[in-house]
């Protein structure tokens, strides 16, 4: 089984554009990293800009779910 832990201070720059870094702890595999991106960004390292249209759509869905 695997679980997520917040990255150590020295690993935080794995993600760009202010993305939050997490490490996937998995006993059977080497550690790997994931990014939780800030609004407006996406991609493995949060490098990609989310088009405005998509951002608005996501906000609308968020509000609907609330």
């Amino acid at each position: 089984t695997s679980h997520l832990v917040k990255c150590a201070e020295k690993e935080k720059t794995f993600c760009v554009n202010g993305g939050e870094c997490f490490m996937v702890k998995d006993l059977s595999n080497p550690s790997r990293y994931l990014c939780k991106c800030q609004p407006g960004f996406t991609g493995a390292r949060c490098t990609e800009n989310v088009p405005m249209k998509v951002q608005n759509q996501e906000k609308a869905e968020e509000l609907y779910q609330k």
Epitope: E9, K10, E11, K12, T13, F14, V16, N17, G18, R32, G43, A44, R45, T47, E48
Partner: antibody, heavy 116, light 107 residues
């Protein structure tokens, strides 16, 4: 041991094309982030392009957008920089580098000279 | 794009001196600031990343500090092999941008 070896540089005329290669070994290529950085003679460092081999996502500096294409072949552990419509100002040593938490490993560089 | 400004552009120092190089970003880059050392004809070498994290294998006389827009690289006791050019780089957002470099020369 991590190794990056660039090749493909040379002399090319303005408007010409060149493809640079960056052969990687000693690490999991598909799990990294590969960047190209260049340095004009006697000048500083300029970031050029990046690719995430795992998903193929790419990014470019405005100065090369539409002219340069970065790609990667995970089966060959090699990244490429296809350079078209070359200009005199593209003359530089081109380095590839891996990025984990910063640009931690660099190749030795390959010189591209654009001149008639 | 984020502009990176290094100072000084060059400095002369003696072996054993304490050397400080500063780097200023045109906007907040949090702690995403790296320092590289480059010797003539060679590729840059990573010294510090995340503003203050020493890269593996780099001597402890090198240290980095700062966050936001103002950063410092310090060499506590300059050694003969430290004479080189040093570059700062923001790695907060693409395009990653470098300072213009600081050349450390022998006095």
């Amino acid at each position: 041991e991590v190794q990056l070896v660039e090749s493909g540089g040379g002399l090319v005329q303005p408007g010409g094309s060149l493809r640079l290669s960056c052969a990687a070994s000693g690490f999991t290529f598909s799990g990294t982030w590969i960047h190209w950085v260049r340095q004009a003679p006697g000048k500083g460092l300029e970031w050029v392009a990046a690719i995430t081999p795992a998903d193929g996502s790419t990014n470019y500096a405005d100065s090369v957008k539409g002219r340069f294409t970065i790609s990667a072949d995970t089966s060959k552990n090699t990244a490429y920089l296809q350079m078209n419509s070359l200009r005199a100002e593209d003359t530089a040593v081109y380095y590839c580098a891996t990025y984990m938490f910063a640009m931690d490993y660099w190749g030795q560089g390959t010189l591209v000279t654009v001149s008639s | 794009d984020i502009q990176m400004t290094q100072s000084p552009s060059s400095l002369s120092a003696s072996v054993g001196d304490r050397v400080t190089i500063t780097c200023r970003a045109s906007q907040d880059v949090s702690i995403s600031l790296a320092w590289y050392q480059q010797k003539p004809g060679k590729a840059p070498k990573l010294l510090i990343y995340g503003a203050s994290n020493l890269e593996s294998g780099v001597p402890s006389r090198f240290s980095g500090s700062g966050s936001g827009t103002d950063f410092t690289l310090t060499i506590s006791s300059l050694q003969p092999e430290d004479f080189a050019t040093y570059y700062c780089q923001q790695h907060y957002t693409l395009p990653f941008t470098f300072g213009q470099g600081t050349k450390v020369e022998i006095k």
